[in-house]
């Protein structure tokens, strides 16, 4: 008789999750010489240990500490790019501008990007059927706590000028409930970070509005200023041209506003 299984509102663990994490780890450590010392089996063992046999609504940052320790990585603190609701463009940017880093360019971010996982309380099983949804079920689920933990650490490490890419096509360009708005903004260290520079990415070709004047951007400016960090904002009217100019800065068309 099959044992009763908790039904959650979110999708279940990603198919072949263990193999995906292990393979990503091997690939990352091969590409990044500074992480060659990392033993991927140990990293995966620590990852497993964070959520297996634990109630998927009762995960804590402490559960992820062994994984955080193994995945400790130094990125240039003045080359950090945060993003909110515009991941693909942020990643395209750091693929071209190789000296800048998003969270997903670090080992731990790379391992978990786009994956879902959860276990079951009192069984050592991975739940491939369903996992808790942040809104409908609980916020202290394995995926949300992971991203909260790594995002906090990433923001804490930042220094000098920190950039953030924001999606100008959304009704809330800056969303206080996003990971950026709820975690990263509050963990930038004023004694290390001089300026947060927002890049507001426009969606429509004919959109010439100054989205830096958007009420939610003003709200972000207020939060940042209260934390004794300077704030600046730039409109990126043509993201396609923006990327092209990052690739080829000498191009004559790259002197005009993008």
């Amino acid at each position: 008789v099959p044992r009763w299984r908790q039904q959650w509102s979110g999708p279940g663990t990603t198919k072949r999750f263990p193999e995906t994490v292990l393979a990503r780890c091997v690939k990352y450590t091969e590409i990044h010489p500074e992480m060659r010392h990392v033993d991927c089996q140990s990293v995966w063992d620590a990852f497993k240990g964070a959520f297996i046999s634990k109630h998927p609504c009762n995960i804590t940052e402490e559960d992820y500490q062994p994984l955080m320790k193994l995945g400790t990585q130094t990125v240039p603190c003045n080359k950090i790019l945060l993003w909110s609701r515009i991941k693909d463009l942020a990643h395209q940017f750091t693929q071209v501008q190789r000296d800048m880093f998003t969270l997903e360019d670090t080992l731990l971010g790379y391992l978990a990007d786009d994956l879902t996982w959860c276990g079951e309380f009192n069984t050592s099983k991975i739940n491939y059927q369903s996992c808790p949804d942040w809104r409908k079920d609980c916020s202290n689920n394995p995926v949300s706590v992971f991203w909260k933990t790594v995002s906090r650490r990433f923001a804490e490490a930042a220094c000098d000028v920190v950039h953030v890419m924001l999606n100008g096509s959304r009704s809330k360009i800056f969303d206080k409930n996003s990971t950026f708005g709820s975690v990263e903004v509050h963990n930038l260290q004023p004694e290390k970070v001089q300026t947060l520079e927002a890049w507001v990415i426009h969606g429509g070709r004919e959109d010439s509005r100054d989205l830096c004047q958007d009420p939610t951007i003003k709200e972000l400016e207020s939060i940042i200023s209260k934390r004794n960090i300077q704030f600046s904002c730039k409109n990126i009217y043509r993201p396609d041209k923006f990327l092209q100019c990052v690739k080829n800065p000498e191009d004559s068309s790259c002197t005009s506003e993008i």
């Epitope: 263990p18 292990l22 393979a23 491939y128």
Partner: antibody, heavy 122, light 107 residues
């Protein structure tokens, strides 16, 4: 019936190579991490290789790293161990073993083959 | 590496006796311990995993226990067919390691 059958063992000179095979039947082979475990003449057990369910990930202890290669063919339900630069200390009974769980690497072995003997001697 | 020590290489017992086979880990392995039985001329067979979970089809006279660094396999009433080598193994951290084995002999 769940079964693992090893083959390919034999006598080989130091520095030589050998390829072991393991034919799996009676279960969904592609759902399981698989292992090679060896037993020395003194009866000590040591795992020598692991491969993930889809075959993308492999891992070895330092004692065989760079000399042994584990691979699998999920279409044929076969597991392999290519051994090269063999040493006298590789002399052992080699077992193909299945992971005890089908959702991740549990690292305990619930099905073992009968084994195939590898002797490295000049 | 975690060393798994089975201090008794041999144990002698009689049919019907209760026997305890012990295993000590060099560090805490968080109950991630498996036990195997290997009868003469055969391959090892899984008896117990996660220190106390009996594998399917294993007679209930076999019981696993322990936590931290100390683990035991208990056979409540030894049968003649239990003559075998018994191995513990930690499935906690890399590299996974086995104990040296305990040979159970029937008087």
């Amino acid at each position: 019936e769940v079964q693992l059958v090893e083959s390919g063992g034999g006598l080989v000179k130091p520095g030589g190579s050998l390829k072991l095979s393991c034919a799996a039947s009676g279960f969904t082979f592609s759902d399981y991490f698989m292992y090679w475990v060896r037993q020395t003449p003194e009866k000590r057990l040591e795992w020598v290789a692991i491969i993930s369910d889809g075959g993308i990930y492999t891992y070895y202890p330092d004692s065989v790293k760079g000399r042994f290669t584990i691979s699998r063919d999920n279409a044929k339900n076969n597991l392999y161990l290519q051994m090269s630069s063999l040493k006298s200390e590789d002399t052992a009974m080699y077992y193909c073993a299945r992971d005890g769980r089908d959702d991740y690497d549990g690292w305990y072995f619930d099905v073992w083959g009968a084994g195939t003997t590898v002797t490295v001697s000049s | 590496d975690i060393v798994m020590t089975q201090s008794h290489k041999f144990m002698s017992t009689s049919v019907g006796d209760r026997v305890n086979i012990t295993c000590k880990a060099s560090q805490d392995v968080n109950t991630a311990v498996a036990w195997y039985q290997q009868k003469p001329g055969q391959s090892p067979k899984l008896l117990i995993y996660w220190a106390s979970t009996r594998h399917a089809g294993v007679p209930d006279r076999f019981t696993g226990s322990g936590s931290g660094t100390d683990y035991a396999l208990t056979i409540s009433s030894v049968q003649a067919e239990d003559l075998a080598l018994y191995y513990c193994q930690q499935h906690y951290s890399t590299p996974r390691t086995f104990g040296g084995g305990t040979k159970l002999e029937i008087k």
